[in-house]
Protein backbone atom coordinates (compact mmCIF):
# COMPACT_ATOMS: atom_id res chain seq x y z
CA UNK A 1 0.00 0.00 0.00
CA UNK A 2 2.83 2.26 0.85
CA UNK A 3 4.80 1.69 -2.21
CA UNK A 4 1.22 2.13 -3.97
CA UNK A 5 1.31 5.34 -2.92
CA UNK A 6 5.19 6.57 -3.51
CA UNK A 7 4.52 5.89 -7.13
CA UNK A 8 1.84 7.71 -7.07
CA UNK A 9 3.57 10.34 -5.59
CA UNK A 10 6.20 10.09 -7.74
CA UNK A 11 3.59 10.28 -10.84
CA UNK A 12 2.33 13.78 -9.78
CA UNK A 13 5.67 15.16 -9.97
CA UNK A 14 5.98 17.42 -12.66
CA UNK A 15 8.74 19.35 -14.22
CA UNK A 16 9.89 23.01 -14.74
CA UNK A 17 12.61 24.99 -16.40
CA UNK A 18 13.90 28.25 -15.07
CA UNK A 19 16.67 29.52 -17.08
CA UNK A 20 18.27 32.66 -17.99
CA UNK A 21 19.26 33.11 -13.88
CA UNK A 22 23.04 32.33 -14.13
CA UNK A 23 25.70 33.26 -16.31
CA UNK A 24 25.82 31.40 -19.47
CA UNK A 25 22.28 30.22 -19.06
CA UNK A 26 21.29 28.12 -22.05
CA UNK A 27 19.41 29.74 -24.92
CA UNK A 28 17.09 26.86 -25.86
CA UNK A 29 14.99 24.36 -23.86
CA UNK A 30 17.38 22.42 -22.44
CA UNK A 31 14.64 20.45 -20.26
CA UNK A 32 12.58 17.97 -22.05
CA UNK A 33 10.23 15.80 -19.61
CA UNK A 34 8.81 12.53 -21.06
CA UNK A 35 8.27 8.93 -20.06
CA UNK A 36 9.10 9.99 -16.08
CA UNK A 37 11.79 11.41 -16.68
CA UNK A 38 14.21 14.17 -17.58
CA UNK A 39 16.22 14.48 -20.83
CA UNK A 40 18.47 16.87 -20.50
CA UNK A 41 19.92 18.55 -24.01
CA UNK A 42 23.89 19.87 -24.11
CA UNK A 43 24.33 21.50 -27.52
CA UNK A 44 27.32 22.12 -28.87
CA UNK A 45 28.19 24.00 -32.46
CA UNK A 46 28.29 22.27 -36.04
CA UNK A 47 31.80 22.58 -36.34
CA UNK A 48 32.80 20.74 -32.92
CA UNK A 49 34.26 17.67 -34.18
CA UNK A 50 36.13 16.33 -31.14
CA UNK A 51 35.09 17.32 -27.63
CA UNK A 52 34.36 16.12 -23.99
CA UNK A 53 30.36 16.92 -22.66
CA UNK A 54 30.34 16.66 -18.89
CA UNK A 55 26.82 17.13 -17.15
CA UNK A 56 27.01 18.76 -13.88
CA UNK A 57 24.47 19.03 -11.08
CA UNK A 58 25.90 21.82 -9.16
CA UNK A 59 28.90 21.10 -8.61
CA UNK A 60 29.22 17.31 -9.19
CA UNK A 61 29.84 15.36 -12.56
CA UNK A 62 26.92 13.23 -13.29
CA UNK A 63 27.56 11.74 -16.59
CA UNK A 64 30.50 12.17 -19.10
CA UNK A 65 30.80 11.86 -22.85
CA UNK A 66 34.06 11.70 -25.24
CA UNK A 67 33.95 12.12 -28.59
CA UNK A 68 37.44 11.69 -30.56
CA UNK A 69 38.72 10.45 -33.73
CA UNK A 70 42.08 8.72 -34.15
CA UNK A 71 44.99 9.19 -36.15
CA UNK A 72 43.18 7.54 -39.35
CA UNK A 73 40.02 9.37 -38.24
CA UNK A 74 38.52 6.68 -36.81
CA UNK A 75 35.61 7.73 -34.14
CA UNK A 76 35.66 6.79 -30.61
CA UNK A 77 33.14 7.66 -27.95
CA UNK A 78 34.03 6.88 -24.34
CA UNK A 79 31.44 7.70 -21.30
CA UNK A 80 33.16 7.32 -18.20
CA UNK A 81 30.34 8.07 -15.98
CA UNK A 82 27.67 5.58 -16.84
CA UNK A 83 24.64 7.25 -18.23
CA UNK A 84 21.94 7.07 -20.84
CA UNK A 85 22.85 9.13 -23.17
CA UNK A 86 22.22 10.11 -26.85
CA UNK A 87 24.76 11.84 -29.35
CA UNK A 88 23.46 13.53 -32.10
CA UNK A 89 25.22 16.11 -34.52
CA UNK A 90 25.25 19.29 -32.54
CA UNK A 91 23.68 18.01 -29.28
CA UNK A 92 24.49 15.39 -26.43
CA UNK A 93 21.25 14.37 -24.57
CA UNK A 94 21.27 12.64 -21.06
CA UNK A 95 18.62 11.18 -19.20
CA UNK A 96 17.64 11.08 -15.68
CA UNK A 97 15.37 9.04 -14.48
CA UNK A 98 13.06 7.71 -10.89
CA UNK A 99 12.38 12.11 -10.49
CA UNK A 100 12.03 13.35 -7.08
CA UNK A 101 12.97 16.59 -5.37
CA UNK A 102 16.64 15.75 -4.58
CA UNK A 103 17.09 16.41 -8.69
CA UNK A 104 15.83 19.80 -8.19
CA UNK A 105 19.44 21.82 -8.38
CA UNK A 106 21.22 23.44 -11.14
CA UNK A 107 22.52 21.40 -14.21
CA UNK A 108 25.76 22.56 -16.21
CA UNK A 109 26.62 21.20 -19.78
CA UNK A 110 30.26 21.68 -19.52
CA UNK A 111 31.63 21.22 -22.64
CA UNK A 112 35.44 20.99 -23.84
CA UNK A 113 35.86 21.35 -27.12
CA UNK A 114 39.53 19.76 -28.66
CA UNK A 115 38.62 20.04 -32.23
CA UNK A 116 39.00 22.01 -33.81
CA UNK A 117 41.75 24.40 -31.89
CA UNK A 118 42.03 26.08 -29.67
CA UNK A 119 41.10 24.22 -26.89
CA UNK A 120 37.89 25.61 -25.43
CA UNK A 121 35.53 25.05 -22.35
CA UNK A 122 31.88 26.43 -22.47
CA UNK A 123 29.21 26.36 -19.25
CA UNK A 124 25.39 26.27 -20.13
CA UNK A 125 23.10 25.72 -17.27
CA UNK A 126 19.61 26.21 -16.06
CA UNK A 127 16.95 25.36 -13.05
CA UNK A 128 15.89 22.31 -12.67
CA UNK A 129 12.88 22.99 -10.60
CA UNK A 130 10.27 19.99 -9.88
CA UNK A 131 7.30 21.10 -8.49
CA UNK A 132 3.72 19.00 -7.82
CA UNK A 133 0.76 20.27 -10.30
CA UNK A 134 -2.35 21.51 -9.25
CA UNK A 135 -4.35 18.79 -10.42
CA UNK A 136 -1.96 16.25 -8.27
CA UNK A 137 -2.12 18.75 -5.15
CA UNK A 138 -6.19 18.78 -5.58
CA UNK A 139 -5.73 15.09 -5.51
CA UNK A 140 -3.91 14.67 -2.75
CA UNK A 141 -6.04 17.05 -0.69
CA UNK A 142 -9.12 15.19 -1.75
CA UNK A 143 -8.40 11.69 -1.90
CA UNK A 144 -7.61 11.33 1.52
CA UNK A 145 -10.86 12.62 2.34
CA UNK A 146 -12.67 11.05 -0.13
CA UNK A 147 -11.55 8.07 1.23
CA UNK A 148 -12.40 8.90 4.71
CA UNK A 149 -15.79 9.46 3.34
CA UNK A 150 -16.11 6.30 1.93
CA UNK A 151 -14.79 4.47 4.56
CA UNK A 152 -17.08 5.77 7.29
CA UNK A 153 -20.07 5.30 4.99
CA UNK A 154 -19.23 2.00 4.46
CA UNK A 155 -18.60 1.86 8.63
CA UNK A 156 -22.27 2.84 8.64
CA UNK A 157 -23.52 0.95 6.01
CA UNK A 158 -22.25 -1.77 7.92
CA UNK A 159 -23.78 -1.23 11.49
CA UNK A 160 -27.10 -0.35 9.92
CA UNK A 161 -27.10 -3.79 8.51
CA UNK A 162 -26.28 -5.05 11.18
CA UNK A 163 -28.87 -3.27 13.00
CA UNK A 164 -31.70 -4.53 10.93
CA UNK A 165 -30.87 -7.95 10.70
CA UNK A 166 -30.35 -8.24 14.35
CA UNK A 167 -33.60 -6.75 14.81
CA UNK A 168 -35.43 -8.84 12.51
CA UNK A 169 -33.67 -12.27 13.64
CA UNK A 170 -34.82 -10.68 17.58
CA UNK A 171 -38.23 -10.26 16.56
CA UNK A 172 -38.67 -13.26 14.98
CA UNK A 173 -36.66 -15.79 17.09
CA UNK A 174 -37.77 -14.45 20.90
CA UNK A 175 -41.11 -13.44 20.28
CA UNK A 176 -43.80 -16.21 19.36
CA UNK A 177 -46.76 -14.25 19.59
CA UNK A 178 -45.76 -11.57 18.30
CA UNK A 179 -48.60 -11.22 14.97
CA UNK A 180 -51.14 -11.65 18.02
CA UNK A 181 -49.62 -9.09 20.19
CA UNK A 182 -49.65 -6.81 16.96
CA UNK A 183 -53.26 -7.49 16.42
CA UNK A 184 -54.02 -6.95 20.03
CA UNK A 185 -52.37 -3.73 20.12
CA UNK A 186 -54.35 -2.76 16.89
CA UNK A 187 -57.79 -3.79 18.41
CA UNK A 188 -56.85 -2.05 21.84
CA UNK A 189 -56.17 1.21 19.52
CA UNK A 190 -59.57 1.39 17.41
CA UNK A 191 -61.77 1.06 21.49
CA UNK A 192 -59.94 3.98 22.94
CA UNK A 193 -60.17 5.58 19.33
CA UNK A 194 -63.98 4.60 19.30
CA UNK A 195 -63.92 6.08 23.46
CA UNK A 196 -62.79 9.40 22.09
CA UNK A 197 -65.46 9.94 19.63
CA UNK A 198 -67.97 9.42 21.99
CA UNK A 199 -66.81 11.70 24.74
CA UNK B 1 55.65 18.53 -19.37
CA UNK B 2 54.39 15.99 -21.92
CA UNK B 3 57.04 13.34 -21.94
CA UNK B 4 57.20 9.98 -23.82
CA UNK B 5 60.21 7.45 -23.46
CA UNK B 6 60.37 4.17 -25.34
CA UNK B 7 62.24 1.09 -24.42
CA UNK B 8 62.37 -2.49 -25.38
CA UNK B 9 64.32 -1.91 -28.32
CA UNK B 10 67.35 -4.24 -29.66
CA UNK B 11 68.64 -6.81 -31.56
CA UNK B 12 66.19 -10.08 -32.50
CA UNK B 13 66.36 -12.80 -35.25
CA UNK B 14 64.02 -13.14 -37.85
CA UNK B 15 60.98 -14.35 -36.56
CA UNK B 16 61.47 -13.60 -33.45
CA UNK B 17 59.32 -11.36 -30.94
CA UNK B 18 59.85 -7.93 -28.90
CA UNK B 19 58.02 -5.76 -27.15
CA UNK B 20 58.28 -2.67 -27.08
CA UNK B 21 57.12 -0.06 -24.33
CA UNK B 22 56.43 3.75 -24.08
CA UNK B 23 55.66 5.13 -20.54
CA UNK B 24 54.09 8.11 -20.48
CA UNK B 25 54.02 11.03 -17.75
CA UNK B 26 53.00 15.13 -17.75
CA UNK B 27 49.19 15.01 -19.08
CA UNK B 28 46.43 12.53 -18.74
CA UNK B 29 47.57 9.42 -20.54
CA UNK B 30 43.43 7.80 -20.89
CA UNK B 31 42.70 11.35 -22.84
CA UNK B 32 44.73 10.48 -25.77
CA UNK B 33 44.92 8.26 -28.62
CA UNK B 34 48.51 6.41 -28.93
CA UNK B 35 50.33 5.64 -31.87
CA UNK B 36 53.16 3.46 -33.00
CA UNK B 37 55.52 5.42 -36.09
CA UNK B 38 58.60 3.55 -37.06
CA UNK B 39 61.24 4.88 -39.44
CA UNK B 40 63.66 2.77 -41.09
CA UNK B 41 67.12 3.21 -41.23
CA UNK B 42 67.37 6.89 -43.79
CA UNK B 43 64.21 6.37 -44.81
CA UNK B 44 60.41 8.38 -44.23
CA UNK B 45 57.87 7.91 -41.24
CA UNK B 46 55.33 5.10 -41.45
CA UNK B 47 52.96 4.33 -38.92
CA UNK B 48 52.11 1.48 -37.51
CA UNK B 49 49.40 0.94 -35.39
CA UNK B 50 46.91 3.06 -33.11
CA UNK B 51 44.94 2.29 -30.12
CA UNK B 52 42.07 4.36 -28.45
CA UNK B 53 41.43 5.75 -25.24
CA UNK B 54 40.24 2.38 -23.32
CA UNK B 55 41.53 0.00 -25.56
CA UNK B 56 38.04 -0.76 -27.37
CA UNK B 57 39.60 0.91 -31.04
CA UNK B 58 42.79 -0.65 -32.51
CA UNK B 59 44.27 -0.19 -35.77
CA UNK B 60 47.60 -1.58 -37.84
CA UNK B 61 49.09 -0.66 -40.99
CA UNK B 62 48.65 -3.79 -43.54
CA UNK B 63 52.40 -4.56 -43.48
CA UNK B 64 52.12 -5.84 -39.42
CA UNK B 65 48.73 -6.77 -39.26
CA UNK B 66 48.27 -10.26 -37.99
CA UNK B 67 52.11 -10.18 -36.36
CA UNK B 68 51.51 -6.95 -34.19
CA UNK B 69 49.50 -6.00 -30.89
CA UNK B 70 48.92 -3.01 -29.77
CA UNK B 71 47.74 -2.15 -26.13
CA UNK B 72 48.16 0.24 -22.94
CA UNK B 73 47.42 0.10 -18.98
CA UNK B 74 45.83 3.44 -18.26
CA UNK B 75 46.62 2.89 -14.82
CA UNK B 76 50.51 2.46 -15.15
CA UNK B 77 50.45 5.40 -17.83
CA UNK B 78 51.86 3.07 -20.35
CA UNK B 79 51.50 2.07 -24.36
CA UNK B 80 52.94 -1.62 -25.37
CA UNK B 81 53.70 -2.97 -28.74
CA UNK B 82 53.83 -6.51 -28.95
CA UNK B 83 56.27 -7.67 -32.56
CA UNK B 84 56.00 -10.87 -33.10
CA UNK B 85 57.60 -13.02 -36.24
CA UNK B 86 59.51 -10.13 -37.31
CA UNK B 87 61.03 -9.24 -40.68
CA UNK B 88 64.15 -7.51 -41.61
CA UNK B 89 62.15 -5.35 -42.99
CA UNK B 90 60.66 -4.54 -39.75
CA UNK B 91 64.16 -2.87 -38.43
CA UNK B 92 63.38 0.51 -37.15
CA UNK B 93 63.27 3.63 -35.23
CA UNK B 94 59.78 2.90 -33.49
CA UNK B 95 58.64 5.93 -31.94
CA UNK B 96 55.50 6.54 -29.68
CA UNK B 97 53.56 9.55 -30.35
CA UNK B 98 50.56 10.77 -29.47
CA UNK B 99 47.22 11.93 -30.94
CA UNK B 100 46.71 15.24 -30.15
CA UNK B 101 43.04 15.16 -31.83
CA UNK B 102 44.40 16.78 -35.12
CA UNK B 103 48.06 15.73 -35.03
CA UNK B 104 51.26 14.03 -33.68
CA UNK B 105 51.76 16.96 -31.09
CA UNK B 106 54.27 14.78 -29.08
CA UNK B 107 56.91 11.81 -29.76
CA UNK B 108 59.36 10.18 -27.98
CA UNK B 109 63.21 9.75 -28.69
CA UNK B 110 62.61 6.46 -30.30
CA UNK B 111 63.74 2.42 -29.55
CA UNK B 112 65.80 1.05 -32.03
CA UNK B 113 64.45 -2.36 -33.18
CA UNK B 114 67.33 -4.34 -35.11
CA UNK B 115 65.91 -7.38 -37.08
CA UNK B 116 69.37 -9.41 -38.47
CA UNK B 117 70.59 -12.79 -38.07
CA UNK C 1 45.17 3.49 -49.57
CA UNK C 2 45.54 7.23 -49.94
CA UNK C 3 49.03 8.21 -51.48
CA UNK C 4 51.42 11.17 -50.04
CA UNK C 5 53.55 12.44 -52.74
CA UNK C 6 56.28 15.67 -52.19
CA UNK C 7 58.32 17.39 -54.58
CA UNK C 8 60.87 18.27 -54.60
CA UNK C 9 62.90 15.46 -52.84
CA UNK C 10 65.75 17.66 -51.64
CA UNK C 11 66.05 21.87 -52.11
CA UNK C 12 68.96 24.31 -50.96
CA UNK C 13 68.18 27.81 -50.33
CA UNK C 14 70.14 30.47 -49.06
CA UNK C 15 69.89 31.99 -46.01
CA UNK C 16 67.16 34.52 -45.89
CA UNK C 17 65.28 33.34 -48.76
CA UNK C 18 61.73 31.59 -49.49
CA UNK C 19 61.69 27.73 -49.48
CA UNK C 20 58.69 25.83 -51.06
CA UNK C 21 57.77 22.20 -50.54
CA UNK C 22 54.61 20.58 -52.25
CA UNK C 23 52.61 17.73 -51.67
CA UNK C 24 49.94 16.13 -53.17
CA UNK C 25 47.12 13.50 -51.83
CA UNK C 26 46.12 10.43 -54.48
CA UNK C 27 42.34 11.81 -53.30
CA UNK C 28 41.08 14.87 -51.65
CA UNK C 29 41.66 15.91 -48.24
CA UNK C 30 38.67 17.97 -47.67
CA UNK C 31 36.34 17.12 -44.96
CA UNK C 32 33.77 19.20 -43.35
CA UNK C 33 35.44 22.14 -44.36
CA UNK C 34 38.76 21.18 -43.36
CA UNK C 35 41.82 19.53 -44.72
CA UNK C 36 43.05 17.01 -43.48
CA UNK C 37 46.89 17.72 -43.92
CA UNK C 38 49.51 18.07 -41.50
CA UNK C 39 53.56 19.07 -42.05
CA UNK C 40 56.48 17.44 -39.59
CA UNK C 41 60.33 18.90 -39.44
CA UNK C 42 62.28 16.30 -38.50
CA UNK C 43 66.18 17.20 -37.67
CA UNK C 44 68.65 14.83 -37.82
CA UNK C 45 68.92 12.21 -34.87
CA UNK C 46 65.52 13.90 -33.13
CA UNK C 47 61.98 12.74 -33.73
CA UNK C 48 59.36 14.73 -35.93
CA UNK C 49 58.23 18.27 -34.41
CA UNK C 50 54.79 19.40 -35.12
CA UNK C 51 54.59 22.50 -37.56
CA UNK C 52 51.09 22.85 -38.89
CA UNK C 53 47.53 21.05 -38.89
CA UNK C 54 44.45 21.30 -40.61
CA UNK C 55 46.65 22.76 -43.83
CA UNK C 56 47.13 25.73 -42.01
CA UNK C 57 47.20 26.35 -38.74
CA UNK C 58 50.29 26.76 -37.10
CA UNK C 59 50.91 25.06 -34.13
CA UNK C 60 51.75 26.90 -31.06
CA UNK C 61 55.03 28.01 -30.59
CA UNK C 62 56.16 27.71 -34.33
CA UNK C 63 58.40 30.61 -35.55
CA UNK C 64 55.26 32.38 -38.07
CA UNK C 65 58.01 32.32 -40.98
CA UNK C 66 56.23 28.97 -41.62
CA UNK C 67 52.82 28.29 -43.30
CA UNK C 68 50.98 26.24 -45.14
CA UNK C 69 48.52 26.45 -48.07
CA UNK C 70 46.18 24.58 -50.18
CA UNK C 71 43.18 22.27 -50.36
CA UNK C 72 41.75 18.99 -51.89
CA UNK C 73 44.62 17.47 -53.07
CA UNK C 74 47.81 20.08 -53.47
CA UNK C 75 49.23 21.60 -50.06
CA UNK C 76 51.96 23.81 -49.48
CA UNK C 77 54.37 24.32 -46.84
CA UNK C 78 56.50 27.77 -46.82
CA UNK C 79 59.28 28.88 -44.88
CA UNK C 80 59.34 32.93 -45.75
CA UNK C 81 62.66 33.49 -44.71
CA UNK C 82 64.71 30.48 -44.41
CA UNK C 83 66.88 30.47 -40.69
CA UNK C 84 69.75 28.24 -40.26
CA UNK C 85 67.96 26.07 -37.75
CA UNK C 86 65.22 25.05 -40.47
CA UNK C 87 67.78 22.23 -42.33
CA UNK C 88 65.59 19.46 -41.51
CA UNK C 89 64.07 16.87 -43.21
CA UNK C 90 60.14 18.06 -43.67
CA UNK C 91 57.12 15.63 -43.93
CA UNK C 92 53.39 15.95 -44.98
CA UNK C 93 50.66 13.34 -43.51
CA UNK C 94 47.11 12.83 -43.53
CA UNK C 95 44.43 11.58 -41.18
CA UNK C 96 41.70 11.92 -43.53
CA UNK C 97 41.42 8.33 -43.21
CA UNK C 98 43.28 4.79 -41.57
CA UNK C 99 45.81 3.99 -42.48
CA UNK C 100 47.15 7.69 -42.04
CA UNK C 101 50.29 8.13 -44.82
CA UNK C 102 53.46 9.89 -44.54
CA UNK C 103 54.79 11.39 -47.69
CA UNK C 104 58.75 10.81 -48.39
CA UNK C 105 59.95 13.41 -47.27
CA UNK C 106 61.79 17.00 -48.56
CA UNK C 107 65.31 17.45 -47.49
CA UNK C 108 66.20 21.39 -47.43
CA UNK C 109 69.57 22.58 -47.10
CA UNK C 110 70.98 25.68 -47.04
CA UNK C 111 72.63 26.83 -50.35
Known amino acids: MKSGLWYFFLFCLRIKVLTGEINGSANYEMFIFHNGGVQILCKYPDIVQQFKMQLLKGGQILCDLTKTKGSGNTVSIKSLKFCHSQLSNNSVSFFLYNLDHSHANYYFCNLSIFDPPPFKVTLTGGYLHIYESQLCCQLKFWLPIGCAAFVVVCILGCILICWLTKKKYSSSVHDPNGEYMFMRAVNTAKKSRLTDVTL | EVQLVESGGGLVQPGGSLRLSCAAS????????MDWVRQAPGKGLVWVSN????????NFAPSVKGRFTISRDNAKNTLYLQMNSLRAEDTAVYYC??????????WGQGTLVTVSS | DIVMTQSPDSLAVSLGERATINCKSS??????????LIWYQQKPGQPPKLLIF???TRQTGVPDRFSGSGSGTDFTLTISSLQAEDVAVYYC?????????FGPGTKVDIK
Open chain 2, 97 to 106: ARWGHYAFDS
Open chain 2, 26 to 33: GFTFSDYW
Open chain 2, 51 to 58: IDHDGNII
Open chain 3, 27 to 36: QSLLSSGYNY
Open chain 3, 54 to 56: YAS
Open chain 3, 93 to 101: QHHYSSPPT
